[in-house]
């Protein structure tokens, strides 16, 4: 059920996944919508508590039943993710936040004319996720017009504080406004030896690239295919970064593929959704439900319509000597990061992903063939 | 692979599940062995850091590969759980710890002759998990000979501090030495309305009772069977307690069963293992692996031999028109608490649990038919 209404002075009790900091309840809902498991959120508005370190906290929540008890809490704003909603969604957030300092790793500072130019600098810098700009009204004259580019592990500020004379905002890469190079090539027989920031399991290099694209700090990736000799590393998608923003060392190895995040690709929001079916492939994960359905398309639709389902494996009916029952078995699954925990072959399953993230791809994106 | 050796001045990096406090590395390994997911541990010995609040920390760890990187750390002791080992195990710990104060909820204090009598008091008190006894050498004369009975949510101390003149230790209930009443009856059509401390999913009331028996604070339970009218509560096992140690209110309801923890049952260590097969029953959980095997017994053995496997579902081969391949499919599974996340019927699976916890039941126990 799609619930767009937010509940003022209400907190959802329990179900906490994690806490991040966001400048508004709207942005908190955006984070919840993109989080692999978040279905509900509680945002602690300014002045919601005597302790300012708790202001702007965005508490991401999950629930097996998709609901949680509501309790009164002054200054809290609660609501539901848009996962359950049909409308087109965007990760793009053009809002700027006056008198808010969004804290992160300040890795670059420069003097620029205005906040718009600061946001453009952030958008055109590989590492920048958000910025804080000291306006002409900033109390310290020496720091006026200073543009601080920032990043964190999560892509959201570590904390947010009130600070007069500053303006903060997010990179507009996901609005398709970056002027940095968009490298669509996938390089075969290549391993990149740079920093591993995370690793996930993926069925192919294209899914690995999509995961890298909407990971907050991934700049490029290496994917080990099913034919990779080290069994424990097969289907591993290594999400990578480097200080320079480019790979430092390329190692030539068969059955590995490497490539870049598509976060800078103009006129296309990062490709969020993985529509393919993977034959003779089982996606392992945490099981949500088992339902009997006709065909893998129906299984995928069943997964898409279940807010908690992230991926599925469908077993066609092999009772060929009993033609009456042509329904197969559809296993609905999830995991902590939205990716299978393992991928197996040769067991007759047909696997794929929920299509609920497809609505985060804009019209331009869907015209681009991911291959 | 069974590794009994401990590694001094070594810490395992990553894989943290949770941190508890234990008086020794040996007890830390015991906790890890009984934890549903723990495969490795790092124990911070006394003087391991400048911060005494970090001493005696027992960090429970898991790893998909069953190994973790080792890093040098002065005062750390690391090792592996005994889940991977063939030997008989016991939850019984008769050791006492001199000059250590194990902190918890001090709910009862009395003057007794010696530490042994204090340990007996703890063993014969329904709530007591561990104790601290002030000896005749305790600095404060007024508190000498004082026996403090303690409990915590987890069954392990909240912290452990050095304190001259005290002796601490654990209840000997799991050694079969409690003199409290052992009530083996299971009461049909009964719901107990007392405090719920936890809830798990179980296939029957006997498994529910076993889970209650080795839960640190469960004194009695209520189980809702498959025929319970509220679908969302079917197979739910409510773990319960009360201040008095006995149920206060019994409500008569069909398709519910209630009973008591067997923690006080003499000459039998709590029954840890669930050997039955459950026909036409699917246990849902996080999938570890899928293997083709002949028969549910082999499936159970495969699960037992996999240190991370907690339960399984086996699908017999239905290719009756092709008699050659009589192997069925064996799904190895786990969850955060060792119990299925859901139980479904009518899908043709045969489910059961790993038998690796059977080695925690002593000879006396295994002679007692759980039914």
């Amino acid at each position: 059920e799609c619930v767009t209404k937010v509940f003022k002075d209400i907190s959802f009790q329990g179900g906490d996944l994690s806490t991040v900091f966001t400048p508004s309840a709207t942005y908190c809902r955006l984070v919840c919508t993109h989080h692999p498991r978040c279905l509900l959120f509680t945002f602690m508005a300014e002045s919601s508590s005597d302790d300012p370190t708790k202001w702007f906290a965005c508490i991401l929540k999950d629930s097996v039943t998709e609901i949680l008890p509501m309790v009164n809490m002054t200054g809290a704003i609660s609501g539901y993710s848009f996962k359950q909603c049909p409308q087109q969604l965007s990760t793009c957030s053009k809002d700027v936040y006056v008198n808010l300092d969004m804290k992160g790793m300040n890795y670059n500072s420069s003097v620029v004319k205005n906040a718009r130019e600061c946001q453009e600098r952030c958008t055109d810098d590989a590492h920048c996720q958000f910025f804080t700009y000291a306006t002409g009204y900033f109390p310290s004259v020496d720091h006026r017009k200073m543009c601080l580019l920032k990043y964190t592990r999560t892509g959201t500020p570590t904390t947010i504080t009130k600070l007069n004379g500053v303006v903060s905002g997010f990179s507009l890469k996901s609005c398709g406004l970056s002027n940095l190079a968009c490298i669509r090539d996938i390089f075969p027989n290549t391993v990149l030896a740079d920093l591993n920031i995370d690793s996930v399991v993926a069925p192919d290099a294209f899914v690995c690239r999509r995961i890298c694209t909407h990971h907050p700090t991934c700049l490029f990736f290496t994917f080990f295919s099913q034919a990779w000799p080290k069994e424990s590393q097969r289907h591993l998608c290594l999400l990578k970064t480097s200080e320079s923003g480019l790979p430092s060392t390329r190692i030539t190895k068969s059955h590995a593929l490497s490539g870049f995040s598509l976060q800078h690709c103009r006129h296309s929001v990062p490709v969020f959704c993985h529509p393919s079916f993977y034959n003779d492939t089982d996606f392992l994960g945490e099981e949500l439900d088992i339902v009997d359905v006709k065909g893998q398309e129906t299984c995928q639709k069943t997964c898409t319509n279940n807010a908690r389902c992230q991926f599925f494996t469908y077993y066609p009916s092999h009772r060929l000597c009993n033609e009456r029952n042509r329904r197969g078995r559809c296993y609905l699954k999830l995991s902590s990061n939205g990716s299978p925990t393992r991928i197996l072959h040769g067991r007759g399953g047909i696997s794929g992903y929920s299509l609920r993230l497809c609505k985060m791809d804009n019209v331009c994106t869907t015209k681009i063939n991911p291959r | 692979e069974c590794v009994t050796k401990v590694f001094k001045d070594i810490s395992f990096q990553g894989g943290d599940l949770s941190t508890v406090f234990t008086p020794s590395a040996t007890y830390c390994r015991l906790v890890c062995t009984h934890h549903p997911r723990c495969l490795l541990f790092t124990f911070m010995a006394e003087s391991s850091s400048d911060d005494p609040t970090k001493w005696f920390a027992c960090i429970l760890k898991d790893s998909v590969t069953e190994i973790l990187p080792m890093v040098n750390m002065t005062g750390a002791i690391s090792g592996y759980s005994f889940k991977q080992c063939p030997q008989q195990l016991s939850t019984c710990s008769k050791d006492v710890y001199v000059n250590l104060d194990m902190k918890g909820m001090n709910y009862n204090s009395s003057v007794v002759k010696n530490a042994r009598e204090c340990q007996e008091r703890c063993t014969d008190d329904a709530h007591c998990q561990f104790f601290t006894y002030a000896t005749g050498y305790f600095p404060s004369v007024d508190h000498r000979k004082m026996c403090l009975l303690k409990y915590t949510r987890t069954g392990t101390p909240t912290t452990i501090t050095k304190l001259n003149g005290v002796v601490s230790g654990f209840s000997l209930k799991s050694c079969g030495l409690s003199n409290l009443a052992c009530i083996r009856d299971i009461f049909p059509n009964t719901v107990l309305a007392d405090l719920n401390i936890d809830s798990v999913v179980a296939p029957d009331a006997f498994v529910c009772r076993r889970i209650c028996t080795h839960h640190p604070t469960c004194l009695f339970f209520t189980f809702f069977s498959q025929a319970w009218p509220k679908e969302s509560q079917r197979h739910l096992c409510l773990l319960k307690t009360s201040e008095s140690g006995l149920p206060s209110t019994r409500i008569t309801k069909s398709h519910a069963l209630s009973g008591f923890s067997l923690q006080h049952c003499r000459h039998s260590v709590p029954v840890f293992c669930h050997p039955s097969f459950y026909n036409d029953t699917d246990f849902l959980g996080e999938e570890l692996d899928i293997v083709d095997v002949k028969g549910q017994e082999t499936c159970q053995k495969t699960c037992t031999n996999n240190a991370r496997c907690q339960f399984f579902t086996y699908y017999p081969s239905h290719r009756l028109c092709n008699e050659r391949n009589r192997r069925g499919r064996c799904y190895l599974k786990l969850s955060s608490n060792g119990s299925p996340t859901r139980i479904l019927h009518g899908r043709g699976g045969i489910s059961g649990y790993s038998l690796r916890l059977c080695k925690m039941d002593n000879v006396c126990t295994t002679k007692i038919n759980p039914r």
């Epitope: 000799p229 080290k230 590393q233 190692i251 030539t252 190895k253 | -």
Partner: nanobody, 124 residues
Framework: QVQLQESGGDSVQAGGSLRLSCIAS????????MGWYRQAPGHQCEFVSH???????YYADSVKGRFTISRDNAKNTVYLQMNSLKPEDAAVYYC????WGGGRSTCVNPIGYWGQGTQVTVSS
């Protein structure tokens, strides 16, 4: 039990040489790619050198021409010969098997197998 044990770290003057060794056990050494990574205090983990299972070698630009990686499959050992050492080469050096990159906060990360590190100090 997989183990990688580095040795050879020491304090040397700038311009000096050191040879690091890493003995591997608990896995099939011949099939594994081996590498050296380093981390200086306050810096991120840095790739140093890599040798594939078939003997192909790779180096970071900062060490090319000065460092040489080699392996002896009979001894399950990988070496790093470091010549013309500079103060900026000072770091903890980690040996890794099938690692494909260090971690963000520390070199040691769940991908591949890692040693515990050996300290190299270079004074000017």
């Amino acid at each position: 039990q997989v183990q990688l044990q580095e040795s050879g770290g020491d304090s040397v003057q700038a311009g000096g040489s050191l040879r690091l060794s890493c003995i591997a056990s608990g896995f099939t050494f011949d099939d594994s790619d081996m590498g050296w990574y380093r981390q200086a205090p306050g810096h991120q983990c840095e790739f140093v050198s890599h040798i594939t299972n078939d003997g192909t070698t790779y180096y970071a630009d900062s060490v090319k021409g000065r460092f040489t990686i080699s392996r002896d499959n009979a001894k399950n050992t990988v070496y790093l010969q470091m010549n013309s050492l500079k103060p900026e080469d000072a770091a903890v050096y980690y040996c890794a098997a099938d690692a494909w990159g260090g971690g963000r906060s520390t070199c040691v990360n769940p991908i591949g197998y890692w040693g515990q590190g050996t300290q190299v100090t270079v004074s000017s």
